[in-house]
């Protein structure tokens, strides 16, 4: 049994640093491997993350930790039984992967304007709490080339936008996704999308 | 109410092993590392050994490396200090003290919060 | 290792008046804000250590507030608003960051 593609992991900056790694070979990954983790530090102890499959070869490990600070060092180590198969360390400050915003809502009874709000995945005494940035993602369900990013580079989690922007009479999504350029991390996953129909009145034209 | 009680000093000759014991109750000993710190007649005070709360993690100081040894039984409760090889210069009293929250991820310090009434360690011939 | 220097070694005071010692470290005692590794003991006459401050400036349970621990990184003060006649001993710091944990001389503190 061999690691055929080395564990690289991301922390989320608050209570979880996700694991990936491949095998050269089909593998029941919860029963065969163990992957051990020790924060540098003084009288710390080694805790172990059961690994879950993540395709044939692939598997994943979801390591529980406390509130992570930028000194936080681990090491890792990845057992099969008693054969250590691969050790590395990882410093969760320099791999963050943000969670994902959540409660996006659109707005749609503010005088042509559509509104929509999320709300910031992270709580108020987390670091990152203030130093996330964000991108709307809003398409048309019936027209694919109908696709637009607006990138929200102010800290409230809303996106205002004149409803005339978007043609009216048909349905559209939205999703939003978080980065922090602070860190100068990956950005998260796109929040569950939400779907509204627009419409709005058109101006009356005068001849 | 948090109790720390050492036993097994005494007088012995250089050269000669001694076996401190130290009992605790009052928290919940298997979550927290403990400290052995001695303190010599009329001098200031010197940790001697620390030890994680699943016992997997264990420290010394240079002065008693490879000489003593360090152990819990958390059945019982007891945090152990074997001293061998023992010299005029281990003599102290040894006091045993509560350390931080081993078994969370990151350590949590609060500080030796709790100590031991102390035993007394004499090495001379 | 890391040298704990504690100053004065000696401190006499008058009942009332404030007091303050000095510790610094050879290396940062600093993890993340917050977390400095120092802490405070008293020790008085034919007693054990008894903790005052941990982490720099945290008070233990217990401990009356007029002791109070500052400082970051190398540089640490302990303050006695007024010191009253209990407060005889010796005060020493330590440092936990990193092992071997390590003291500093001790402060004889003594009433005028």
């Known amino acids: 049994m061999k690691v055929l593609q080395e564990p690289t992991c991301v922390s989320d900056y608050m209570s979880i640093s996700t694991c990936e790694w491949k095998m050269n070979g089909p593998t029941n990954c919860s029963t065969e491997l163990r992957l051990l983790y020790q924060l540098v530090f003084l009288l710390s102890e080694a805790h172990t993350c059961i690994p879950e499959n993540n395709g044939g070869a692939g598997c994943v490990c979801h390591l529980l930790m406390d509130d992570v600070v930028s000194a936080d060092n681990y090491t890792l180590d990845l057992w099969a039984g008693q054969q250590l198969l691969w050790k590395g360390s990882f410093k969760p400050s320099e791999h963050v992967k943000p969670r994902a915003p959540g409660n996006l809502t659109v707005h749609t009874n503010v005088s042509d304007t559509l509104l929509l709000t999320w709300s910031n995945p992270y709580p108020p005494d987390n670091y990152l709490y203030n130093h996330l940035t964000y991108a709307v993602n809003i398409w048309s369900e019936n027209d694919p080339a109908d696709f637009r990013i607006y990138n929200v580079t102010y800290l409230e989690p809303s996106l205002r936008i004149a409803a005339s922007t978007l043609k009216s009479g048909i349905s559209y999504r939205a999703r939003v996704r978080a980065w922090a350029q602070c860190y100068n991390t990956t950005w998260s996953e796109w929040s569950p999308s939400t779907k509204w129909h627009n419409s709005y009145r058109e101006p009356f034209e005068q001849h | 109410e948090v109790q720390l009680v050492e036993s097994g000093g005494g007088l012995v000759q250089p050269g000669g092993s001694l076996r401190l014991s130290c009992a605790v109750s009052?928290?919940?000993?298997?979550?927290?590392?403990m400290s052995w710190v001695r303190q010599a007649p009329g001098k200031g005070l010197e940790w001697v050994s620390s030890?994680?709360?699943?016992?997997?993690?264990?420290y010394y100081a240079d002065s008693v490396k490879g000489r003593f040894t360090i152990s819990r039984d958390n059945s019982k409760n007891t945090v152990y200090l074997q001293m061998n090889s023992l010299r005029a210069e281990d003599t102290a009293v040894y006091y045993c003290?509560?350390?931080?929250?081993?078994?969370?991820?990151?350590?949590?310090?609060?500080?030796?919060?709790?100590w031991g009434q102390g035993t007394t360690v004499t090495v001379s011939s | 290792d890391i040298v704990m220097t504690q100053s004065p070694l000696s401190l006499p005071v008058t009942p009332g008046e404030p007091a303050s010692i000095s510790c610094r470290s050879s290396?940062?005692?600093?993890?993340?804000?917050?977390?400095?590794?120092l802490d405070w003991y008293l020790q008085k006459s034919g007693q054990s250590p008894q903790l005052l401050i941990y982490l720099g400036s945290n008070r233990a349970s217990g401990v009356p507030d007029r002791f109070s621990g500052s400082g970051s990184g190398t540089d640490f003060t302990l303050k006695i608003s007024r010191v009253e006649a209990e407060d005889v001993g010796f005060y020493y710091c330590?440092?936990?960051?990193?092992?071997?944990?390590?003291f500093g001389q001790g402060t004889k503190l003594e009433i005028k």
């Open positions: 330590m440092q936990s960051f990193k092992a071997p944990y390590t």
């Open positions: 009052g928290f919940t000993f298997s979550s927290y590392a």
């Open positions: 030890i994680t709360g699943g016992g997997g993690g264990i």
């Open positions: 003290a509560k350390d931080r929250i081993s078994i969370t991820i990151r350590p949590r310090y609060f500080g030796l919060d709790f």
């Open positions: 290396q940062s005692l600093l993890y993340s804000i917050g977390y400095n590794y």
